[in-house]
Interface confidence: medium
């Protein structure tokens, strides 16, 4: 229902805490580069507005949208065309235009540098000092470098966070208790913001119609006891959701998200009795438990899908009278049936049975047309089974850091134009497939490797979408969202392309590796490897192998050496030539 | 006993508008989805229409979208459906029922009420 203020209806929903974290997380996803100190000065003027509102609805700048709201506060930054430059464009154009100006401006990749962790006595003393401004800078931090993160899980972050700091600002051995619990909790957010960033784009590139087949698939997964009409009135919920959140409007996502946990357990009895588990938990902590739930048991003595899509006599009827209807309750029949699958394989089977209807329920004899559609689903059901038992092989095979160097050739051989810190980047994501995944039973590897891979294939997709320099990338990234998987996968090594000049200066180490933390010293070795792909396409697996070993050789070597740089000065260079000669 | 009484038909011109009622007893409304199909003269049952017991979402036939909205009010026990821009093609006796669990076959339906759309 509309409320004649706004700003006042979301702060009384959200309450204060969760208002001022939302409103901060807003200005730091749309812009980037202001100094914290800018943005809690906004957060402050927006929180005072919100707070007289509620005292007096009818008070001045009430009754305006929370767009304008936050698009004016922008608009009187005074260094706004200095910091920012065109974004300072948007602010001639008026509601909705502007906002969708400063979303497009929204960057994936912005210039600032890795998120720093500091000491644990430094953080304690931080995180002591000032609570209130410790989890400022962190929602800050966060949702600059991740103007897509989902606002309300990076509230349940900010929550986890504040729980590890007071548990470990107390043991004895702080860092001890600090590292390994927040490498995790990293770790989870990371993939959060990843998959956050594919739900955007998915309504983004490919609309509402592309998200709500997503999450009608795997919430008929998840939750496969509830029937069909109740997945879709979640799945309609949880679209909304996502397109507030992924449009800026964070105030109205963060409610409407508390509304749907709400409803879902009140109405867990005929959803699932996994809810129970989630439902008493406070509003942030209830949300993610919802989204963390495990597949309920697929419930028994269900007829074989067959029955209603392909021997019922109604069924070019059924398909042509309610086309949404019929397609998303077979999507909903065989996903509930299916959680060995990945949702992406899924919606390539919807996609199939719906051109197979297409074609055959214009025939004279649609039956007999149609009435191999689902056996002609196993090639299609077989590729990426094939995918993961290979790749599983191989992971085992190699181990962690070499599986990801095997993905970081394939992928510069598949397409060398892509920037070397991108492929160093989404190689490495593709290899934590391998620890990720392998490890699972044969049940659950296929659905945790295929939809894993969606979501960092769509990192190279939005990363690329920036500064395109790759038909290849282009292409399969715009022409269908549940085949960018098999569209990377069948990509050859790119013949066409001309081989970059030889650069010395490139595989130059110096005497600063050797203090560079475990994984840097691997990024850095990576991007040598990556070069050296560019340099030599046609190299062979075992050419690189050889060379990758010398250089390990090398960093072992020289950092050990009493005097390091003289080393690498004089052993560089051998290397270097040694190289060009084994790899011709 | 489930018992779903259809009402608001009639005979209307090309163009013009009526609103279906249907009365439900017997069972929990508030928690059944529920639908319009219709039968046209010497035709077989078509879907027209389907809402969830929340009231979204909805769902509509091809052939009605964007002239026909269903919607409920669970406090009477009853399920709308408002018919714009009608044509003669709409012509027929139309059933309101509770949506299937399984099948898109369902159990229950009313009596009907006719709809004529000519001039």
């Known amino acids: 229902e509309a409320h004649k203020s706004e700003i006042a209806h979301r702060f009384n929903d959200v309450g204060e805490e969760h208002f001022i974290g939302l409103v901060l997380i807003t200005f730091s996803q749309y812009l980037q580069k202001c100094p914290y100190e800018e943005h809690a000065k906004l957060v402050k003027e927006v929180t005072d507005l919100a707070k007289a509102c509620v005292a007096d609805e009818s008070a001045a700048n009430c009754d305006k949208s929370l767009h304008d709201i936050f698009g004016d506060k922008i608009c009187a930054l005074p260094s706004l065309r200095d910091t920012y430059g065109d974004v300072a464009d948007c602010c001639e154009k008026k509601e909705p235009e502007r906002n969708e100006c400063f979303l497009h401006h929204k960057d994936d990749k912005p210039d600032l540098p890795p998120f720093a962790r500091p000491e644990a006595d430094v953080l304690c003393k931080a995180f002591h000092d000032d609570e209130k401004a410790f989890f400022g800078h962190y929602l800050y931090e966060v949702a600059r470098r991740h103007p897509y993160f989902y606002a309300p899980e990076l509230l349940y972050y900010a929550q986890k966070y504040k729980a590890i700091l007071t548990e470990c600002c107390e043991a004895a051995d702080k860092g001890a208790c600090l590292t390994p619990k927040l490498d995790a909790l990293e770790g989870k957010s990371l993939i959060s913001a990843a998959q956050e960033r594919l739900r955007c784009a998915s309504i983004q590139k490919f609309g509402d119609r592309a998200y709500k087949a997503w999450a009608l698939v795997r919430l008929s997964q998840r939750f496969p006891k509830a029937d069909f009409t109740d997945i879709s009135k979640i799945v309609t919920d949880l679209t909304k959701v996502h397109k507030e959140c992924c449009h800026g409007d964070l105030l109205e996502c963060a409610d409407d998200r508390a509304d749907l946990a709400k409803y879902m357990c009140e109405h867990q009895e005929t959803i699932s009795s996994h809810l129970k588990e989630c439902c008493d938990k406070p509003i942030l902590e209830k949300a993610h438990c919802i989204y963390g739930l495990h597949n309920d048991e697929t419930p028994a003595g269900l007829p074989a899908v067959a029955e209603e899509f392909v021997e019922d006599k109604d069924v070019c009827k059924n398909y042509e009278e309610a086309k949404d209807l019929f397609l998303g309750k077979f999507l909903y029949e065989y996903s509930r049936r299916h959680p060995d699958y990945s949702v992406v394989l899924l919606l390539r089977l919807g996609k199939a049975y719906e051109a197979t209807l297409k074609k055959c329920c214009a025939t004279d004899d649609p039956h007999a047309c149609y009435a191999k559609v689902l056996d002609e689903f196993q090639p299609l059901v077989d590729e990426p089974k094939n995918l993961v038992k290979q790749n599983c092989e191989l992971y085992e095979q190699l181990g962690d850091y070499n599986f990801q160097n095997a993905l970081l050739v394939r992928y510069t051989k598949k397409v060398p134009q892509v920037s070397t810190p991108t492929l160093v980047e989404i190689s490495r994501s593709l290899g934590k497939v391998g620890s990720k995944c392998c490890k699972h039973p044969e049940a659950e590897r296929l659905p945790c490797v295929e939809d894993y891979l969606s979501v960092v294939l769509n990192r190279l997709c939005v990363l690329h979408e920036k500064t395109p320099v790759s038909e290849k990338v282009t292409k399969c990234c715009s022409e269908s969202l549940v085949d960018r998987r098999p569209c990377f996968s069948a990509l050859g090594p790119d013949e066409t392309y001309v081989p970059k000049e030889f650069n010395a200066e490139t595989f130059t180490f110096h005497a600063d590796i050797c203090t560079l933390p475990e994984t840097e010293r691997k990024i850095k070795k990576q991007t040598a490897l990556v070069e050296l792909v560019k340099h030599k396409p046609h190299a062979t697996n075992d050419q690189l192998k050889t060379v990758v070993g010398e250089f390990t050789a090398l960093l072992d070597k020289c950092c050990s050496a009493e005097d390091k740089e003289a080393c690498f000065a004089v052993e560089g260079p051998k290397l270097v030539e040694s190289s060009k000669a084994t790899l011709g | 006993e489930v018992q779903l009484l259809e009402s608001g038909g009639g005979l209307v011109q090309p163009g013009g508008s009526l609103r279906l009622s249907c009365a439900a007893s017997?069972?929990?409304?508030?928690?059944?989805?529920m639908l319009w199909v219709r039968q046209a003269p010497g035709k077989g049952l078509e879907w027209v229409s389907v809402?969830?017991?929340?009231?979204?979402?909805?769902y509509y036939a091809d052939s009605v979208k964007g002239r026909f909205t269903i919607s409920r009010d669970n406090s009477k026990n009853t399920l709308y459906l408002q018919m714009n821009s009608l044509r003669a093609e709409d012509t027929a006796v139309y059933y309101c029922?509770?949506?299937?669990?399984?099948?898109?076959?369902?159990?229950?339906w009313g009596q009907g009420t006719l709809v004529t759309v000519s001039s």
């Open positions: 017997g069972f929990t409304f508030d928690t059944s989805s």
């Open positions: 029922a509770k949506f299937p669990s399984s099948r898109m076959k369902f159990d229950y």
């Open positions: 809402i969830h017991q929340s009231g979204t979402p909805t």
